[in-house]
């Protein structure tokens, strides 16, 4: 499907609005420090150029690849070396090396200020004064902070952002209408970003075979009535979409995602009975809906798997003929029967099955050797079941904040070398698994919990890769994608760790504590808790609980005082001294 001008092809397929939005996202994800106005200028220049190519595909430079066009445009930025340092060296390279170089310089933790939400009236005025600029600013600010955000999905978020302002800025109580919607978009956006980051890590660090295996398992759970060939086609197409988006090819990615949505809606009967309501929606909403669609009902008459995968005398013959196809079919068959399993568990089972066949098909009596292969799955299944049961029990006992604290202590003891902000961020997010998954019925708990934990632990891996400090983290992150969570779960107290020297400054607090939101107060306290464990890794839970209770009481007392700062100055050193004594 070759076109004389790739840029004209994508402009015509996507339309001007989506074209401009996607180019803005692409540029913002590459040059994360550039000011908004600079990106808008670049996007306008690219758009004008694209229009000339639509008018005449033979016009000068219209035959160039998108990477060449976009890369050339990015390399015109005057302050590239001052702002980005060695990233400027990318511009000396030729495609495709130049694009690879830009990709390698994407920063998962850019040094950008947190987004501050202005007053509702200020936002509504800005929205009414210049809606287009307001929405572009949203795309820019999200994309530069989340350089792997799934671009076509970000357009969907922007559409919802626009709809929220259009509705709520007319409402009698603007704030009551708007703020919950913005909170929801923020939380869903962070979750969407983290999920996509795992997909990109899977593709980039473990290859498309790993991603395809994940997709076979997930789509087989969603579409248990679909034939294996149908699932395989969807997996191939989905892999192409995500490979493109993770590689910065956002126009191709969005175009192919639209094609995939079209195909799914034209072939609902052979995919799933759950697609109907998605397929009536406009494009962005439709694609989102299809991605989030609930699992279809399992066919009633599915036979036992043992016949084809254990009892059959042809197992080794079938395996040898086409290993990946045979394993893919095994994974498909297992996953469609087990919506109650996490995708990661299903992949572990497929891996265990593959290892057994590799060993047994070379044995004297293969059938005798692999006859009990399904029995070997039992401990693999029980491990996440027990983990979810235990952690949900702990969550229900402690509540979210204290559950997060338990995880903070646990992970700080496991990997105390990791930076305190990273431990706080990751443990807080690990702790959110309780509220998200523990209320669900038993059959949905494990897929919810373990697949969510995989997303959160990927964030730890991504941050740690930027600044590696722990061999244990590197090992868990790089050895096996599917065993990351069990690897972290199995880590014990790091006995080799030399406790951090006590620093009174770390435990010095001021009156500004009192004006913080509840969430910010929690983060402050949790930061102190991590530092406490780094200082005393063998402190007992009772000791830590005692110190944290005293901390809460001290902050509450000083925030009620008339002279708050004086109280913090006087009571702070007492709290520090008492804490040191309690932990001695």
């Amino acid at each position: 499907d070759t076109h004389k001008s790739e840029v004209a092809h994508r402009f015509k397929d996507l339309g001007e609005e989506h074209f401009k939005g996607l180019v803005l996202v692409a540029f913002s994800q590459y040059l994360q420090q550039c000011p908004f106005e600079e990106h808008v200028k670049l996007v306008n220049e690219v758009t004008e150029f694209a229009k000339t190519c639509v008018a005449d595909e033979s016009a000068e430079n219209c035959d160039k690849s998108l990477h060449t066009l976009f890369g050339d445009k990015l390399c015109t930025v005057a302050t590239l070396r001052e702002t980005y340092g060695e990233m400027a060296d990318c511009c000396a390279k030729q495609e495709p090396e130049r694009n690879e170089c830009f990709l390698q310089h994407k920063d998962d933790n850019p040094n950008l200020p947190p987004l501050v939400r202005p007053e509702v009236d200020v936002m509504c005025t800005a929205f009414h004064d210049n809606e287009a600029t307001f929405l572009k600013k949203y795309l820019y600010e999200v994309a530069r902070r989340h350089p792997y955000f799934y671009a076509p999905e970000l357009l969907f978020f922007a559409a919802r952002y626009k709809a929220a302002f259009a509705e709520c800025c007319q409402a009698a109580d603007k704030a009551a209408c708007l703020l919950p919607k913005l909170d929801e978009l923020r939380d869903e956006g962070k979750a969407s970003s983290a999920k996509q980051r795992l997909k990109c890590a899977s593709l980039q660090k473990f290859g498309d075979r790993a991603f395809k295996a994940w997709a076979v398992a997930r789509l087989s759970q969603k579409f248990p009535k679909a034939e294996f060939a149908e699932v395989s086609k969807l997996v191939t197409d989905l892999t192409k979409v995500h490979t493109e988006c993770c590689h910065g090819d956002l126009l191709e990615c969005a175009d192919d995602r639209a094609d995939l949505a079209k195909y799914m809606c034209e072939n609902q009967d052979s995919i799933s009975s759950k697609l109907k309501e998605c397929c009536d929606k406009p494009l962005l909403e439709k694609s989102h809906c299809l991605a989030e669609v609930e699992n279809d009902e399992m066919p009633a008459d599915l036979p036992s798997l043992a016949a084809d995968y254990v009892e059959s005398k042809d197992v080794c013959k079938n395996y040898a003929e086409a290993k990946d196809v045979f394993l893919g079919m095994f994974l498909y068959e297992y996953a469609r029967r087990h919506p109650d399993y996490s995708v990661m568990l299903l992949l572990r089972l497929a891996k265990a099955y593959e290892a057994t066949l590799e060993k047994c098909c070379a044995a004297a009596d293969p059938h005798e050797c692999y006859a009990k292969v399904f029995d070997e799955f039992q401990p693999l299944v029980e491990e996440p079941q027990n983990l979810v049961k235990q952690n949900c029990e702990l969550f229900e006992q402690l509540g979210e904040y204290k559950f997060q604290n338990a995880l903070l202590v646990r992970y700080t003891k496991k990997v105390p070398q990791v930076s305190t902000p990273t431990l706080v961020e990751v443990s807080r997010n690990l702790g959110k698994v309780g509220a998200k998954c523990c209320k669900l019925p038993e059959a949905k708990r494990m897929p919810c919990a373990e697949d969510y934990l995989s997303v959160v632990l990927n964030r730890l891996c991504v941050l740690h890769e930027k600044t590696p400090v722990s061999e244990k983290v590197t090992k868990c992150c790089t050895e096996s994608l599917v065993n990351r969570r069990p690897c972290f779960s199995a880590l014990e107290l790091d006995e080799a760790y030399v406790p951090k020297a006590f620093n009174a400054e770390t435990f010095t607090f001021h009156a500004d504590m009192c004006t913080l939101s509840e969430k910010e107060k929690q983060v402050k306290k949790q930061t102190a808790l991590v530092e406490l464990v780094k200082h005393k890794p063998k402190a007992t839970k009772e000791q830590l609980k005692g110190v944290m209770d005293n901390f809460a009481a001290f902050v509450e007392k000083c925030c009620k005082a008339d002279d708050k700062e004086a109280c913090f100055a006087e009571e702070g050193p007492k709290f520090v001294a008492a804490s040191q004594a309690a932990l001695a």
Epitope: Q390, R410, A490, E492
Partner: nanobody
Framework: EVQLVESGGGLVQAGGSLRLSCAAS????????MGWFRQAPGKEREFVAT????????YYADSVKGRFTISRDNAKNTVYLQMNSLKPEDTAVYYC?????????????????WGQGTQVTVSS
């Protein structure tokens, strides 16, 4: 602070049984998950079994499942490990451990208080 004292270890023939006890001092015994761990000579300490604070949840290592049973009596501040069908590979020092608030995790780092251990030797 919780003190733990194990008893009931000894020498037993393969196929035989033993019952280990762990007595805890302290008024808050029922707030703790209790675990049994073991360490064979030259090996790492390994998880054996655990029971949550109420006794409602138990977990076992695959190697002992179906042979060992953990139980507790909160009125007596005691946790038990009934070991049946013992094998020579069960030979080890058995430790009792306590974890505040825990549902009974399998990691030794979760447990703050440990007993001195009791020797179990299974001869063939």
């Amino acid at each position: 602070e919780v003190q733990l004292v194990e008893s009931g270890g000894g020498l037993v023939q393969a196929g035989g049984s033993l019952r280990l006890s762990c007595a805890a001092s302290g008024r808050t015994f029922s707030s703790y998950a209790m675990g049994w761990f073991r360490q064979a000579p030259g090996k790492e300490r390994e998880f054996v079994a655990t029971i949550n604070w109420s006794g409602g949840s138990t977990y076992y290592a695959d190697s002992v499942k179906g042979r060992f049973t953990i139980s507790r009596d909160n009125a007596k501040n005691t946790v038990y490990l009934q070991m049946n069908s013992l094998k020579p590979e069960d030979t080890a020092v058995y430790y009792c451990a306590a974890d505040l608030y825990g549902p009974g995790f399998v990691l030794s780092m979760e447990y703050d208080y440990w007993g001195q251990g009791t020797q179990v030797t299974v001869s063939s």
